[in-house]
């Protein structure tokens, strides 16, 4: 059957996949869509109710923070 992730298991998966980057429950504003009226897609919609793979999870990781310079 479809591989879904919900609740605490979804949070665990996001924390693991995103490592030290952190993650969003909703894609950042403007992510993957030029329409301001497009409804914001959330990870729960995408992974709890539909098949969810690692690439889908990675889309909700925060960007890598640039290394601090001296």
């Amino acid at each position: 059957g479809p591989e879904t992730l919900c609740g605490a298991e979804l949070v665990d998966a996001l924390q693991f996949v995103c490592g030290d980057r952190g993650f969003y429950f909703n894609k950042p504003t403007g992510y993957g869509s030029s329409s301001r009226r497009a409804p914001q897609t959330g990870i729960v919609d995408e992974c709890c109710f539909r098949s969810c793979d690692l690439r889908r999870l990675e889309m909700y990781c925060a960007p890598l923070k640039p290394a601090k310079s001296a």
């Epitope: 995103c18 490592g19 793979d53 690692l54």
Partner: antibody, heavy 123, light 107 residues
Framework: QLQLQESGPGLVKPSETLSLTCTVS??????????WGWIRQPPGKGLEWIGG???????YYNPSLKSRVTMSVDTSKNQFSLKLSSVTAADTAVYYC???????????????WGRGTLVTVSS | DIQMTQSPSSVSASVGDSVTITCRAS??????LAWYQQKPGKAPKLLIY???SLQSGVPSRFSGNGSGTDFTLTISSLQPEDFATYYC?????????FGPGTKVDIK
């Protein structure tokens, strides 16, 4: 070059907790590019992924074992550990620790393995 | 979980032969598949990742192909050191799962 070495008791009694440690040498466990995992192989059988850990301590476990598994990392010792509780004879296996490419590569494969350690569950 | 199946479960071949092993996933996994070689008493060794990319240091006689649900590992000219068991692994979904293995032995 980087190497992994498992250590821990080779014999565990039923209902007790199996404890293993993997020592990383020749490199740092604190790499944003890599994850660290445990895989086991019962004698004469195939491979089963137990779970993985990131250097920050975040974990993800195979749901089939989740209720019995705990993983931890000690960056000061360059080690990560596995605990498997309430073991039975079915947990008898060779346990491998492995390095896994993570999100920065987008692949999630095990590119470096320890030699493995046989753990027998018997009274 | 995604179930991985391999065929054949074992194959007998001679040095110089070409051998092809098939791996099938119970649902589509794009190209997120790896192949490992394991010799008796040793740890698995990564051969191929991303279905067709050769891991550094692995001889070019090993090649991988496929996407979606069907994948193959081909050893173009079998060498004595290639007699081993080969496993596929999907890296598309949690939990990561392996095929049951294909043993390549001497005819």
């Amino acid at each position: 070059q980087l190497q992994l070495q498992e250590s821990g008791p080779g014999l565990v009694k039923p209902s007790e907790t199996l404890s293993l440690t993997c020592t990383v040498s020749g490199g740092s466990i604190r790499s944003s590019s890599y994850y660290w995992g445990w895989i086991r192989q019962p004698p004469g059988k195939g491979l089963e992924w137990i779970g993985g850990i990131y250097y920050s301590g975040s974990t993800y476990y195979n749901p089939s074992l989740k209720s019995r598994v705990t993983m931890s990392v000690d960056t000061s010792k360059n080690q990560f550990s596995l605990k498997l509780s309430s073991v039975t004879a079915a947990d008898t296996a060779v346990y491998y620790c492995a390095r896994q490419r993570g999100h920065s590569s987008g692949w999630w494969y095990f590119d470096l393995w320890g030699r493995g350690t046989l753990v027998t569950v018997s009274s | 979980d995604i179930q991985m199946t391999q065929s054949p479960s074992s194959v007998s071949a001679s040095v110089g032969d070409s051998v092809t092993i098939t791996c099938r996933a119970s649902q589509g996994i794009s190209s997120y598949l790896a192949w490992y070689q394991q010799k008796p008493g040793k740890a698995p060794k990564l051969l191929i990742y991303a279905a067709s990319s050769l891991q550094s240091g692995v001889p070019s006689r090993f090649s991988g192909n496929g996407s979606g649900t069907d994948f193959t590992l081909t050893i173009s000219s079998l060498q004595p050191e290639d007699f081993a068991t080969y496993y596929c692994q999907q890296a598309n979904n949690f939990p990561f799962t392996f095929g049951p293995g294909t043993k390549v032995d001497i005819k």
